[in-house]
Interface confidence: medium
Amino acid sequence: MNGSEYFVKIQSFLGGAPTEDLKALSQQNVSMDLATFMKLRTDAVLPLTVAEVQKLLGPHVEGLKAEERHRPVRDWILRQRQDDLDTLGLGLQGGIPNGYLVLDLSMQEALSGTPCLLGP
């Protein structure tokens, strides 16, 4: 069974998938469509790297541009370094500016919804 066929079989169960499962899927050439990606738990999507999302979505990575204002894409963008987002070639804006240090202060993030940044 190839990656695409496997993805079809598990697609209906993916809404609640944890980050670890999404990371594993990104290595299996599944080409997750955007409709499915948009239904994923925000907290599961946030830790994914730009490279992992690109592998997870395959051709559908190009559609992130259309979803950049919607969750979970919007929140995921806020967590990525702008340099990394730029490598997607989609003009996605709102990432962490170059030279900033990200502090994983979960309480601060829980209150504000955004990571805590220290300037250069």
Epitope: S4, E5, V8, N29, S31, D33, A35, G58, P59, H60, E62, G63, K65, A66, E67, D86, T87, L88, G89, L90, G91
Partner: antibody, heavy 120, light 107 residues
């Protein structure tokens, strides 16, 4: 208005290479991947590959992987498709087309096409 | 690779009558399908994306339906300007692939 202007027709000998250009205007060139599709006489459309205009990264159809190179010149908003080791079966019209412009997937905009004739 | 199979190969339709083109994918592609019209000597023109959504400017006589592996393009009332070759395309996974085309002509 989105416009894609391709270079003119080419006649090449078997074994030679050809480089077709595609100048884009009317949208942010680095925000959308550029694809190349060809159509041999009486044949179906055939996807060759694409390029991320921001990073220069590309994906290729395995059928062409060792013969095709897709590049960009960001400063000129131009994409290039070079096909080497030409054979008669490569006689075709070659199109450039960005995918997913705005929020809609698919090839909504196409270049006018470049006819490449391979003949001894 | 995902193989897209179109039927029929050609279609001769009386103006004002409906026309229907089928496209079958060799594996599930969800609704990640687009339809194009190509007139002789011209670049393809996009009609439908995501299986059933019309691009702006496309007449409402064109409609698309289907999901999974079976898709249909319908023209409710064929007009003379609709002659050309129609292609389906999947963008579910690389390599992107097209159907073999259906030629529509007027009786």
């Amino acid at each position: 208005e989105v416009q894609l202007v391709q270079s003119g027709a080419e006649v090449k000998k078997p074994g030679a290479s050809v480089k077709v250009s595609c100048k884009a205007s009317g949208y942010t060139f680095t925000s959308y991947w550029m694809h190349w599709v060809r159509q041999a006489p009486g044949q179906r459309l055939e996807w060759m590959g694409n390029v991320n205009p921001s990073s220069g990264g590309s994906n290729y159809n395995e059928k062409f992987k060792n013969r095709v190179t897709i590049t960009v010149d960001k400063s000129a908003s131009t994409a290039y498709m070079e096909l080497s080791s030409l054979r008669s079966e490569d006689t075709a019209v070659y199109y450039c087309a960005p995918h997913y412009i705005g929020s809609r997937p698919g090839f909504a905009y196409w270049g006018q096409g470049t006819l490449v004739t391979v003949s001894s | 690779d995902i193989v897209m199979t179109q039927t029929p190969l050609s279609l001769s339709v009386t103006p004002g009558q409906p026309a229907s083109i089928s496209c079958k994918a060799s594996q599930n592609v969800g609704t990640n399908i687009a339809w194009y019209q190509q007139k002789p000597g011209q670049s393809p023109q996009a009609l439908i994306y995501s299986a059933s959504y019309r691009y702006s400017g496309v007449p409402d006589r064109f409609s698309g339906s289907g999901s999974g592996t079976d898709f249909t393009l319908k023209i409710s009332r064929v007009e003379a300007e609709d002659v050309g070759v129609y292609y389906c395309q999947q963008y579910n996974s690389y390599p992107l692939t097209f159907g073999g085309g259906t030629k529509v002509e007027i009786k």
